[in-house]
Interface confidence: medium
């Protein structure tokens, strides 16, 4: 079905589309005289060069060396396939509903699935992963520990931009009046530690207390800010005299 | 190629069934296959009800079952399955799924389209 084989066309002779219509758009044979239904990504497409034609736009018929086991299964497709459709642009893109999707296809195909659901349609917002506020993954631990030792605490945040992580020693004054102290501050046993991960668009953050002094003593709170909002968590350090006075829950060790 | 239903059977009114149709056959690839499921009751003519395209990611009802229930398809046990919630007694009719080749994004909803058929399963609703 190569175009230097294509007779008068014939509409007449055409096989009918499906009378629901086709999901992905009509698209045309390798004579460019009956419609078809376009091929969808992961769909089969291809035999002559020709065939390329039989994607949904957007995509391209990519040739397979091998036969795909994927959702297509052993006979991928019938005689003469020899590829599958892919999405032309394989960069992420951020949809109406807030889902990051893996290419613009990818979207095409939700939307697609939200309308036969008698849902809204699903549009591109932006290129690129959407934006979220930060969440913490993993807060920070309440520690209890003996004076001179050392001790820290962790934060994992994430964000979309990435945020930006900071540590305060929140102090309470009278009358329930909270005020916060940007940390390291002018501390000399306190060191603040930062780095991206362990995910993408992931930052953990420590703080080091080395040695352990009375006044160290109090809430520390981990706070992760983006364009999108902030989030925050925190956790109290407790200095006792001696290990003794260190509380133990039945079936776990205290945090040291 | 052989279709073959199960899950059929006598419900009350506002019950529930899930309906299988199990597929076999050697040449059979079911994974290469779009499904439906129709009804025949009494003196009517078969009446397609839902449909799932080949890779299970598109879904199709009509509006006498849309709401109440639902299509889906496991490839790797060959079956497609089909939810029937709060059952009114207009649903009673023997069951029967479909199958046709394609691999496009793509609802069949007339009995000519499909190519193999299951022996059907009886639904009775009573009030």
């Known amino acids: 079905s190569s175009s230097d084989t294509c007779g008068p066309c014939e509409p007449a002779s055409c096989p009918p589309l499906p009378p629901l219509g086709c999901l992905l758009g009509e698209t045309r044979d390798a004579c460019g005289c009956c419609p078809m239904c376009a091929r969808g990504e992961g769909e089969p497409c291809g035999g002559g060069g020709a065939g390329r034609g039989y994607c949904a736009p957007g995509m391209e018929c990519v040739k397979s060396r091998k036969r795909r086991k994927g959702k297509a299964g052993a006979a991928a497709g019938g005689p003469g396939v020899s590829g599958v459709c892919v999405c032309k642009s394989r960069y992420p893109v951020c949809g109406s509903d807030g889902t990051t999707y893996p290419s613009g296809c990818q979207l095409r195909a939700a939307s697609q699935r939200a309308e036969s659901r008698g849902e809204k349609a699903i549009t591109q917002v932006s290129k690129g992963t959407c934006e979220q506020g930060p969440s913490i993954v993993t807060p920070p631990k309440d520690i209890w520990n003996v004076t001179g030792a050392q001790v820290y605490l962790s934060c994992e945040v994430i964000g979309i931009p990435t945020p930006v992580l900071i540590w305060n020693k929140v102090k309470r004054g009278h009358y329930g009046v909270q005020r916060t102290e940007l940390l390291p501050g002018d501390r000399d046993n306190l060191a603040i530690q930062t780095r991206g991960g362990p995910e993408k668009h992931e930052v953990t953050g420590w703080v080091l207390v080395s040695p352990l002094s009375k006044e160290d003593a109090g809430e520390y709170e981990c706070h992760a800010s983006n364009s999108q909002g902030q989030a925050s968590a925190s956790a109290k350090i407790t200095v006792v005299d001696a290990l003794h006075e260190i509380p133990v829950k039945k079936g776990e060790g205290a945090e040291l | 190629v052989q279709l073959q239903e199960s899950g059929g059977g006598l419900v009350q009114t506002g019950g529930s069934l899930r309906l299988s149709c199990a597929a076999s056959?050697?040449?059979?690839?079911?994974?290469?296959?779009?499904m439906g499921w129709f009804r025949h009751a009494p003196g009517k003519e078969r009446e397609f009800l839902t449909a799932?395209?080949?890779?299970?990611?598109?879904?199709y009802y009509t509006d006498s079952v849309k709401g109440r229930s639902t299509i889906s398809r496991d490839n790797a046990k060959n079956t497609v399955y089909l939810q029937l919630n709060n059952l009114k007694p207009e649903d009673t009719a023997v069951y029967y799924c479909?199958?046709?080749?394609?691999?496009?994004?793509?609802?069949?909803?007339?009995?000519?389209?499909?190519?193999?058929w299951g022996q059907g399963t009886q639904v009775t609703v009573s009030s």
């Open positions: 799932i395209t080949w890779s299970g990611d598109y879904t």
């Open positions: 056959g050697r040449s059979f690839t079911f994974s290469s296959y779009a």
């Open positions: 479909a199958a046709k080749f394609s691999q496009v994004s793509a609802f069949f909803a007339t009995v000519s389209e499909y190519e193999y």
